[in-house]
Structure formats: C-alpha cells, structure tokens
C-alpha cells in the first residue's frame, strides 16, 4: 500500500493528513478562518492547487502523480494568527521494487492492454495490482484480467473502457511478505495511448487518365472529427527493381476521404495501402491490406 506521511511542521499546528485513495488532503478546522489554501509541489517544479472555500478544511486533488514524491502544503489564516504546515509524501518501500516500464495502449477502439516489468530489486514473491481512476468521476476500476509471468502480474487486459475519460490515473501497487514495495502511478491521456486501426473500405477506381482512392476513417475510442486524422498512402508499382522508393503521400482527413492522382492507360500493376494517425500525435496505425490496380495489359479498372 502507499506510504504513511511524515509531517515537517510543529505537530501542534494543523494535523494535516492525506488519503491517497480519495486524493483528499484534510486538516483540523480552525475557528474564525479568514483564508485557507492548499497545494502540492512536485518534482517537475510544478504547483497543483485545487479550488478551496475559506470555510473548508480539506481539498481534493484531481490530476496528480505521487510516486516520485510530492510535498503538500496548507496555509490557514484566522482572525488571530496564521498557520502553515508541510507534509512530505514519500514513496516508502525498498528502492527499485516498484513496477517499471509501465505503458498502456487502446486498440480496436474498445480494448486496452497495460504492461509493466517487475522492479529490479523486488523479491520473488512480489505481486502487483493495477487500479484505474478517471480524472473526473474518480470511479475506480480494478484490473479484471491480469497477464502473468511465473505467477507475477506483469500486465492487464481491459475489454470495457466505459469508465474511462480523456485522462485517467493508473496506479500499480505491490505487495510482498518480505519487504515493503513501492508504488508506481501515472496520468495517461487517451489521446496519447490510442492506436488506430488502419482505414477500412479502401477502394480504387481508375479511368483512362486518373485513379481515385477512397477509404473510411477508422472507428476510434475517442470522439474525433475528420480534422483529427492524417493519412499516409503508399502507392507502389509492382515488379520494380529492388531499392526503388515507394511513393508516400500525406493526406489530411476530410468529410469524404479520397485521393485522386494521374495515371494514364495502359497502366502497370500497382498496389496501394493506407495508414492513419491522430494529426497531433502521429502514432501511425498498421497499414491496410494492399489493394491492387492496373495490370500488365492495362484493362483492369475497378478494384475493392
């Protein structure tokens, strides 16, 4: 489990405490409070400060990562005096026992795999557990299907992503009978971790002078518009010399995805395949199946 807290302020002051399950920081209420403020400072020199009303004695953090260690701070002014207290949140447990190389990816629009490796100093009996919370509703999802390596959980498969939002909090806790295991946590944007399927319904129609390629944008987990897609077409002339470069064409997403290019008859046999990416991320999908068009005698016009 995540660590207990050490306080670096007079113990008599505010009695600040943090609940990592709810991300709630609380302190003893003071009479006649005129001002209160809570925030944390992380290792990236950023300050995270939730909204707080003067009469509240707690605050909830929405989007924070804790595994590198953070410092919480509470400032309270009353009509008589001012209080300040800091709270260090260390990642207790033996160094190097936390899950490492953590990554997740969404695929096929509604499936997700997360994988990690056991920490280099973790004991043989270590067991890891993944919890996911979305950043808005704070609903917790426990891993339903673990991927195992010699009995140790080293991954997770989810086939229901309905609880996720555009940014989600991932926590990998560890347990062992021998020693304390450090935790790993991460905030991941679905935008960064979704891997698109290749475009579907790729067709090629040719007339005497041109060929028109059409395709459909892939179904995605995120709600995206056509403007969010970038495509690459690989138009390849068959039976060319080894080392001949393929023609790679970049096409921006459109309401109707199409690419028209000059190709006069008789045309040699060609193939075309397409891949897709989020225009702001450029994590390319795999290529669609190659569609052939043209022929040695130039008679073939329409291909699915």
């Amino acid at each position: 489990e995540k660590s207990d807290l050490r306080t670096v302020a007079p113990a008599s002051s505010l009695n600040v405490r943090f609940d990592s399950r709810t991300m709630n920081l609380s302190w003893d209420c003071q009479e006649n409070t005129t001002f209160s403020k809570c925030f944390l400072t992380d290792k990236k020199n950023r300050v995270v400060e939730p909204r707080l009303s003067n009469n509240e004695c707690s605050c909830t953090f929405r989007e924070i990562c804790l595994h590198e260690g953070v410092t919480f701070e509470v400032h309270v002014n009353t009509s008589q005096r001012g209080f300040q207290q800091k709270l260090l949140y260390p990642n207790s447990g033996r160094e190097g026992t936390a899950a490492q190389n953590f990554s997740c990816f969404i695929y096929n629009a509604d499936l997700m795999n997360c994988t990690w490796a056991r920490g280099p100093t973790a004991p043989r009996d270590v067991q890891y557990f993944l919890y996911i919370r979305n950043s808005k509703r704070r609903r917790e999802i426990r891993c339903p299907y673990y991927i195992q390596d010699s009995g140790t959980h080293v991954g997770c498969h989810l086939d229901n992503l309905s609880g996720l939002t555009s940014r989600n909090y991932f926590l990998v806790n560890g347990t062992s009978r021998e020693i304390g295991i450090q935790f790993f946590d991460s905030l991941l944007d679905t935008k960064k971790i979704e891997r698109f399927n290749p475009p579907s319904n790729v067709t090629v129609r040719c007339n005497t002078t041109h060929c028109l390629v059409r395709w459909k944008q892939p179904r995605t987990y995120q709600k995206l518009s056509y403007l969010d897609f970038q495509y690459q077409l690989d138009v390849h002339r068959k039976n060319t010399q080894p080392g001949t470069e393929n023609l790679l064409i970049n096409v921006s997403g459109d309401l109707e995805n199409r690419y028209n290019f000059p190709s006069s008859e008789p045309r040699a046999k060609h193939s075309v395949k397409i891949r897709a990416a989020d225009v702001r991320i450029l994590n390319w999908s795999s290529w669609s199946e190659a569609i052939e068009f043209g022929s040695d005698d130039g008679h073939h016009h329409h291909h699915h």
Epitope: K44, R46, E49, P50, R51, K136, Q230, L282
Partner: antibody, heavy 123, light 107 residues
Framework: QMQLVQSGAEVKKPGASVKVSCKVS????????MHWVRQAPGKGLEWMGG????????IYAQKFQGRVTMTGDTSTDTAYLELSSLRSEDTALYYC????????????????WGQGTLVTVSS | EIVMTQSPATLSLSPGERATLSCRAS??????LAWYQQKPGQAPRLLIY???SRATGIPDRFSGSGSGTDFTLTISRLEPEDFAVYYC?????????FGQGTKLEIK
C-alpha cells in the same frame, strides 16, 4: 470560431497586484482548460500555468508559487489571471491561450490566443 | 523539465529563398512538437502540430519534419509576410516548454 479577448494594458508599482481578464466567445469556459503564457520585452514565450474551470484546479510553474491565482467566471465565460507582489521582472505581455485538445497542464498545441495584455511594473 | 534549443538565433534571407529552422529537445519528445509564428505586436499563431501537420489555414509552403529530439521547420519559398519570429514547443511532458525562438529577417 473561438475568440479570446483580453483586458487592456496596466501600469503597476512594485509590490502591487494586477488582474488580467480573458473573455471567451464561440465556446463556453467550462469546456476549456485556460492557459496563461507570458513574454517579457524582446524575450521568448514562458508557460505560467493552466486552469480547469470545471473543477477549479490550477497547475502552474513553481516560480510563481504564492503569487499567482487563476480563476474563471463561468457565468460570463471569462478567465482571470492575478499576479501579486509585482516586481520589475514581471513586466511582460500576458497571453491567455487554449486549444482544441487541452488539459490543465498543457495543450496539444495552442490553437487560440488572446491579443495579449501588457503589464508594466515601474516605480 | 525538457529544454528546447532553436538554431540559428537569427536567419537572414531574401524573399523567394528557402528557410530551414531547427529545434532540438534535451530528450525525446516523440512527435509531440508544435511550431508557432509571431509577428511584431501580434500573438503567436499555431503553424504546425504533431511535428509535421499543418494547422488550419496554413499555406503549404510551410512544412515540418523530425521526431525524437531533432525537428525542422522549412519554408520552401519565402514570402514577405513570412519574416517573423518562430518558436517550437514540446507537448510531450509537462511543463510544456518553448524554444527561445528564431528570428527570420529580410536580408
């Protein structure tokens, strides 16, 4: 099309506070994360922080800790940046900025910018 | 935090010429890179995101390339209105940091 319109230039004395506004049109403030970027005269761009009007949480650079407050009024779709204990090195153009895809700690590119508010700190 | 370094600091060219601006990240930022153009007295304008995708309304003489740590903004044929300051920005890791800028001036 979204537009961000900022308040006018301000001249302040060292130690004073300034509050800059950024009015959103073509969108509602609750749909956005609003960011503030500043630019000292003749210098580059510096991200100050971002604010989520929906949950009220702010993420900002530690160098501004204790001096910066980012807020929003969802009834008027206006975001605010307040900077206190002003010093001469705070003299800069202050921009509000947002994008099509944002979180409070940044955007996947800032698509939309206010026109900037010049804050001059001088005794 | 990730440090973005742009070069050259100033680039002097004539209209019609080709401009090549460089941006280097202190660690890999994948393709999470944007380019902005800023003219005197104006706010920055987004030109490129995803290292190579042009933002809406940006002429095709502007192109971006690169991934990982090394990125390039190319203006194939300079128009008089292209003379400005250009900034790169990474959005891989918060805080999202800007380069110090390259001033493109008329020779």
């Amino acid at each position: 099309q979204m537009q961000l319109v900022q308040s006018g230039a301000e001249v302040k004395k060292p130690g004073a506070s300034v509050k800059v506004s950024c009015k959103v049109s073509g969108h509602t403030l609750t749909e956005l994360s609003m960011h503030w970027v500043r630019q000292a005269p003749g210098k580059g761009l510096e991200w100050m922080g971002g604010f989520d009007p929906e949950d009220g949480e702010t993420i900002y650079a530690q160098k501004f800790q204790g001096r910066v407050t980012m807020t929003g009024d969802t009834s008027t779709d206006t975001a605010y940046l307040e900077l206190s204990s002003l010093r001469s090195e705070d003299t800069a153009l202050y921009y509000c900025a947002t994008g099509r895809y944002c979180h409070k700690d940044g955007c996947y590119g800032f698509d939309y910018w206010g026109q900037g508010t010049l804050v001059t700190v001088s005794s | 935090e990730i440090v973005m370094t742009q070069s050259p600091a100033t680039l002097s060219l004539s209209p019609g010429e080709r401009a090549t601006l460089s941006c280097r990240a202190s660690q890999s930022v994948s393709s999470y890179l944007a380019w902005y153009q800023q003219k005197p007295g104006q706010a920055p304008r987004l030109l490129i995101y995803g290292a190579s995708s042009r933002a809406t309304g940006i002429p095709d003489r502007f192109s971006g390339s690169g991934s990982g740590t090394d990125f390039t903004l190319t203006i194939s044929r300079l128009e008089p209105e292209d003379f400005a300051v250009y900034y790169c920005q990474q959005y891989d890791s918060s805080p999202h940091t800007f380069g110090q800028g390259t001033k493109l001036e008329i020779k």
